[in-house]
Interface confidence: medium
């Protein structure tokens, strides 16, 4: 932002009324009036170019310093070319000197040269040659100097003529302020520019109404330079929740709009399934029956729990059941649907029922399922099972009602056979098993599966109608994994545990019952 100038003295604007002191009195500097652009203008002029040594002083009135620390002095003046006078005026000069003196009081007409300190010699960029003078072309020069730091109540300026033909048309003394500024939604007060050129005054800004420093952000600061320019902005303010930036201010969100945090973003329209918000809303309330999960952004539509899984089937396969379902017809407006499967078993004889989570095995954890199928195994025969599949989403926890579908299945399968090792040699294993007598009539055959431990690529199967089998052609001193499963008309029965049996080593041959 451009510096603001506070004028302390303006000769040109005073219309010749300032009455500056000349020394020596009545000689040298003289107040003159002229006409320029059909307007009367005043100037202090001196032109004693033919008179040898000159020491003519013009002193301003006492200027009250006020809050100024560094003053700027702008001079507009014209200087005649010494060669425009007959004989070149050997004592003629083309410069004059600028002085200042600080004081706490006005000395009036008591003028003392010794109190003045020289600021600079003022030389023109352009001198007025004869042809310009005759044609009344005033070659106006503009020079600026600055002085600081000032410490006393006021000051004088003085102009020393040493034999030039010069006219002072304007003397303007001012100091600079960094103007009041709104930047980054922060207000910076009008600040007096410092007096030392390299230094920058740090100024703290204040957030405008309804603006805040964002969490973790820097407080707004600017630097006021000597020339009254604001530099190096640091930090910023953001419109708080419920307000948005409109030009240099924060304006409340219109009804039907909201803003949930301090940010640079504008207010957003209330999302679907929300009630119309009042002015300055930070969020939009959900319609009845709709909810917002704690992690849901305020910009997301309100949602509700899903309906039940649309279609559920339970397909029994021996001691296993495959449960399949389709997603709910109404997702509640969310994509974070998960499913939970629970199991209940009932004994047909007694009609007693209870949870069966501990005794069955699921193909994947039954809670938080994202797929729409699961296999349940290790089911007990002659048992009725009821499976419940519940659909949940991010807002299900906010309501007490549940969305689920159930399917029942009866298990008419055998129990797993109980297996024993009857005998072994270096190349064979004799295995027997048993199942409860009531189930034996339903068994068609038994299937014995065996393989070397550690060899997952190949296995052998033997089927038999009896309750024992000898597995031949085995490798000596080798552990085999053996499982027995009953086969019924309905399919596979429950498999036995997998047993580890080892053949004998060649040096310890002979049958050994275990």
């Amino acid at each position: 932002a451009q510096g603001k100038e506070v004028v302390l003295l303006d000769f040109a604007a005073a219309g010749g009324e300032l009455g500056w002191l000349t020394h020596p009195y009545g000689k040298g500097w003289d107040l003159m009036q002229n006409i320029m652009n059909d307007m009367p203008i005043y100037m202090y002029s001196v032109c004693n170019v033919m008179s040898g040594d000159q020491d003519n002083w013009l002193r301003t009135n006492w200027v009250y310093r006020g809050e100024a620390e560094r003053i700027f002095i702008e001079l507009k003046f014209t200087v005649r070319d010494c060669n425009s006078f007959p004989g070149g005026a050997s004592s003629c000069k083309e410069t004059f000197n600028l002085y200042y003196a600080e004081s706490d009081l006005d000395y009036g007409t008591n003028f003392q040269k010794r109190l003045f300190t020289k600021i600079d010699t003022i030389a023109p960029d352009e001198i007025t040659v004869s042809s310009d003078f005759e044609a009344r072309h005033v070659k106006l020069n503009v020079e600026e100097r600055s002085v600081g730091p000032l410490t006393r109540k006021g000051f004088y300026l003085a102009f020393q003529d040493i034999g030039a033909c010069v006219a002072l048309l304007s003397v303007r003394v001012y100091y600079k302020k960094c103007p009041e500024l709104l930047q980054g939604l922060a207000h910076f007060p009008e600040t007096i520019a410092g007096s030392d050129a390299p230094s920058l005054a740090t100024v703290a800004g204040t957030c405008v109404d309804h603006a805040v420093v964002p969490p973790g952000g820097e407080e707004p600061r600017m630097h006021c330079a000597v020339d009254g320019e604001w530099l190096v902005p640091i930090g910023q303010c953001l419109c708080q929740a419920g307000y948005e930036k409109v030009e240099d201010a924060c304006q409340a969100c219109s009804p039907g709009f909201f803003k949930f945090e301090a940010s640079e973003s504008p207010c957003l329209e209330c999302p679907e399934h929300t009630l119309p918000s009042p002015e300055g809303a930070t969020s939009c309330e959900c319609e009845e029956g709709f909810f917002r999960a704690p992690q849901d952004p305020a910009s997301m539509p309100c949602t509700r729990p899903p309906s039940a899984p649309h279609y559920l089937t339970a397909v029994g396969m021996g001691a296993k059941v495959e449960l399949r379902w389709t997603p709910p017809q109404d997702s509640g407006g969310r994509e974070d649907i998960v499913y939970s499967v629970t199991c209940e078993q009932c004994w047909p004889e007694s009609g007693e029922c209870g949870p069966c989570e501990a005794s069955v095995r699921y193909s994947e954890p039954p809670h938080g399922l994202t797929r729409t199928s699961v296999t349940v195994s290790d089911l007990e025969p002659h048992m009725n099972y009821t499976f419940t599949v519940e659909a949940r989403n991010g807002v299900s926890g906010l309501v007490t009602s549940r969305s689920f579908r159930t399917a029942s299945v009866s298990i008419n399968q055998t129990e797993p056979p109980k297996v024993r090792l009857e005998g072994r040699s270096t190349t064979s294993l004799s295995v027997s098993w048993s199942i409860p007598p009531p189930q034996q009539s339903r068994v068609w055959k038994y299937e014995v599966t065996y393989r070397k431990k550690g060899d997952s690529n190949s296995y052998n199967v033997r089927r038999t109608e009896g309750f024992s089998v000898t597995l031949d052609d085995l490798a000596p001193d080798t552990t085999y994994l053996v499982q027995v499963q009953a086969l019924t008309q309905e399919g596979q029965g429950a498999g036995s545990k997998v047993h580890e049996f080892q053949t004998l080593s060649p040096e310890g041959s002979g049958n050994l019952a275990v």
Epitope: P40, S45, C47, T78, F85
Partner: antibody
């Protein structure tokens, strides 16, 4: 020494024309603003017209505007005043006058000029 | 146009007298004023310019003062050669008007 010598005056009938000349010597003519000033018999001085050092600008008194024309020839060091539509009230001694800013010890020229050097004058009589 | 009024119209004085002629402008002319001396049958001669500056070769008994609208020409010790008519002239505007003149005659 600066010398200005007017010529061309005489008796002329009302409505007639006359051309005055002013021969300059003893100074650099092309540096000077030149003017004509007249003085009716027994009366005071009246400024008539002026011309800048290089031929412009030119100014005229309201009483002669549109009838008189001032000009100069710097190569001949001569100033002219062409007077047309002459009237009885134009009867006067016409002086040629000059101003050189080099002799004017002021920083800014006055809005107009004064006259440092004068000729001896030439009489113009307008009468029937 | 700016009107220039001189007073008195005629002034009778003796050699050695101090005489003052005044000139009033109808509006402010700052210090843009010149004084001339004219003797019968002769061309005017410049005495003073810019109200108080003495023209080259003019005796120091002549002095001028004033600014704005009131001006004066003073001859501090009248000499026989000084009996003449004196004119003021403003050059604050292009009209460059003269006063009507003041005749200084021998008493």
């Amino acid at each position: 020494e600066v010398q200005l010598l007017e010529s061309g005056g005489g008796l002329v009938q009302p409505g007639g024309s006359l051309r005055l000349s002013c021969a300059a010597s003893g100074f650099t003519f092309s540096h000077y603003m030149m003017a004509w000033v007249r003085q009716a018999p027994g009366k005071g001085l009246e400024w008539v017209s002026r011309i800048g050092p290089s031929g412009g600008p030119t100014h005229y008194a309201d009483s002669v505007k549109g009838r008189f024309t001032i000009s100069r020839d710097n190569s001949k060091n001569t100033l002219y005043l062409q007077m047309n539509s002459l009237r009885a009230e134009d009867t006067a001694v016409y002086y040629c006058a000059g101003y050189d800013s080099g002799y004017d010890y002021v920083a800014v020229a006055g809005p107009a000029e004064y006259f440092q050097h004068w000729g001896q004058g030439t009489l113009v009589t307008v009468s029937s | 146009d700016i009107q220039m009024t001189q007073s008195p119209s005629t002034l009778s004085a003796s050699v050695g007298d101090r005489v003052t002629i005044t000139c009033r402008a109808s509006q402010s002319i700052s210090t843009w004023l010149a004084w001339y001396q004219q003797k019968p049958g002769k061309a005017p001669k410049l005495l003073i310019y810019k109200a108080s500056n003495l023209h080259t070769g003019v005796p120091s008994r002549f002095s001028g003062s004033g600014s704005g609208t009131e001006f004066s020409l003073t001859i501090s010790g009248l000499q026989p050669d000084d009996f003449a008519t004196y004119y003021c002239q403003q050059y604050n505007s292009y009209s460059r008007t003269f006063g009507q003149g003041t005749k200084v005659e021998i008493k």
